[in-house]
Interface confidence: medium
Amino acid sequence: LRLLDFPAPVCAQEGLSCRVKNSTCLDDSWIHPRNLTPSSPKDLQIQLHFAHTQQGDLFPVAHIEWTLQTDASILYLEGAELSVLQLNTNERLCVRFEFLSKLRHHHRRWRFTFSHFVVDPDQEYEVTVHHLPKPIPDGDPNHQSKNFLVPDCEHARMKVTTPCMSSGSLWDPNITVETLDTQHLRVDFTLWNESTHYQILLTSFPHMENHSCFEHMHHIPAPRPEEFHQRSNVTLTLRNLKGCCRHQVQIQPFFSSCLNDCLRHSATVSCPEMPDTPEPIPDYMPLWEPRSGSSDYKDDDDKGSSHHHHHH
């Protein structure tokens, strides 16, 4: 979690002198409670916006907006604390609006916005706006919270943001997986314009089961520049054991901008259709593992193999 470095955030508006300050998320009013405190924010809204940094990078940001209630407590409103909590890491970042003048009622409702919290793709956040000073220990809460889910890099607008592009969002491998026969699976995909290696993970499942009955990893060396954007194909030779028939192929690139953390793409091949009069299916789950020559699951023998070609 971080704040956008440009432009400087502004909270002042007509009729209000205000400045934005970094906050430790522990306002002084927690430690020294006040007798009179303002009411809670109203109509808190969080939206996905996009903003450029000073260097020209594009980032997703949380656009936070709320209004004040039309009661007399605005006379005691000294500012607001904005808190963003990333739910999967418990990381929290706060800023404080410090009012430098007293608020007065006027012809329109007071409205505040802040769009400087940079958020990450495919993450969920809890956004809280606390009016300051915070309430006394047993006082009514004067904050409002909302959860905010940031779309992943598949989202059209997200795809062109710097974090998504860094993780390889512009690469579309257009994977096709084809069962050649009972023992061969062919994987085709488009290479990206970078001399980096790829990894193919084949995970196989029995029909209608979600526990994998086999995993196999295959390494594809870095293509040469003349192979960039070309189709590459890999043929995996499998052990043919009944039941382990649904195959998920996942391709992981290792681009320089994201290394081990690049976006992965996958495709699935379903089990073949059952005949009208199916053979009885055994009540066990077959488990198998091919022996591979060039793959990473390498044994002393060479019963199974994987080989790949690049098409120009």
């Epitope: 993970l201 995970t203 526990h211 086999f214 995993e215 066990y284 488990l287 990473d296 699951y297």
Partner: antibody, heavy 116, light 107 residues
Framework: QVQLVQSGAEVKKPGASVKVSCKAS????????ISWVRQAPGQGLEWMGW????????NYAQKLQGRVTMTTDTSTSTAYMELRSLRSDDTAVYYC?????????WGQGTLVTVSS | EIVMTQSPATLSVSPGERATLSCRAS??????LAWFQQKPGQAPRPLIY???TRATGVPARFSGSGSGTDFTLTISSLQSEDFAVYYC?????????FGGGTKVEIK
Amino acid sequence: QVQLVQSGAEVKKPGASVKVSCKASGYTFTRYGISWVRQAPGQGLEWMGWISTYSGNTNYAQKLQGRVTMTTDTSTSTAYMELRSLRSDDTAVYYCARRQLYFDYWGQGTLVTVSS
Amino acid sequence: EIVMTQSPATLSVSPGERATLSCRASQSVSSNLAWFQQKPGQAPRPLIYDASTRATGVPARFSGSGSGTDFTLTISSLQSEDFAVYYCQQYDNWPLTFGGGTKVEIK
């Protein structure tokens, strides 16, 4: 050379939990799954389950389902096996082994004693 | 689950003699069978996989054969270090299962 080094012996009370670690070295950790096998005193070998070090996929023995959890930490090339609600018949040497099916390298074993 | 039955439970053999250990599966496991050797206080050591392929570093006196339901581990000329317990294991189906073991002891 490939090595799997397990954590030390444990003595636990019935109902408690135990977490055994298995640190791998000498190969790329995420290229091979880790299986767990146990052996009660004077008894044969019993397969407990397997975890993919790459995807985190797991398969557990039916009789241990709900009591066992296998995890990995790829940053330290370490696999973990946690067994909960321990009973006296869980007293055994617990082994980690490399690969999903045929186990080509084994840890030295961790003796877990369950006794009140 | 597939039940693996080993016989005999104990085999008494003199050094230099041939030892033949048997392993039977309750249903076909194709060639998806491994053999392990275990000495007291030690972890099992892989000997054979895919029914007949020797693991790395295993001496040629150990050989495996069979497919389907009946498998054999043969030690052509027993050395003193071969006295141990031997287990077979199938990896054709979940759950993976081991035989009860055959103890090879000095006659």
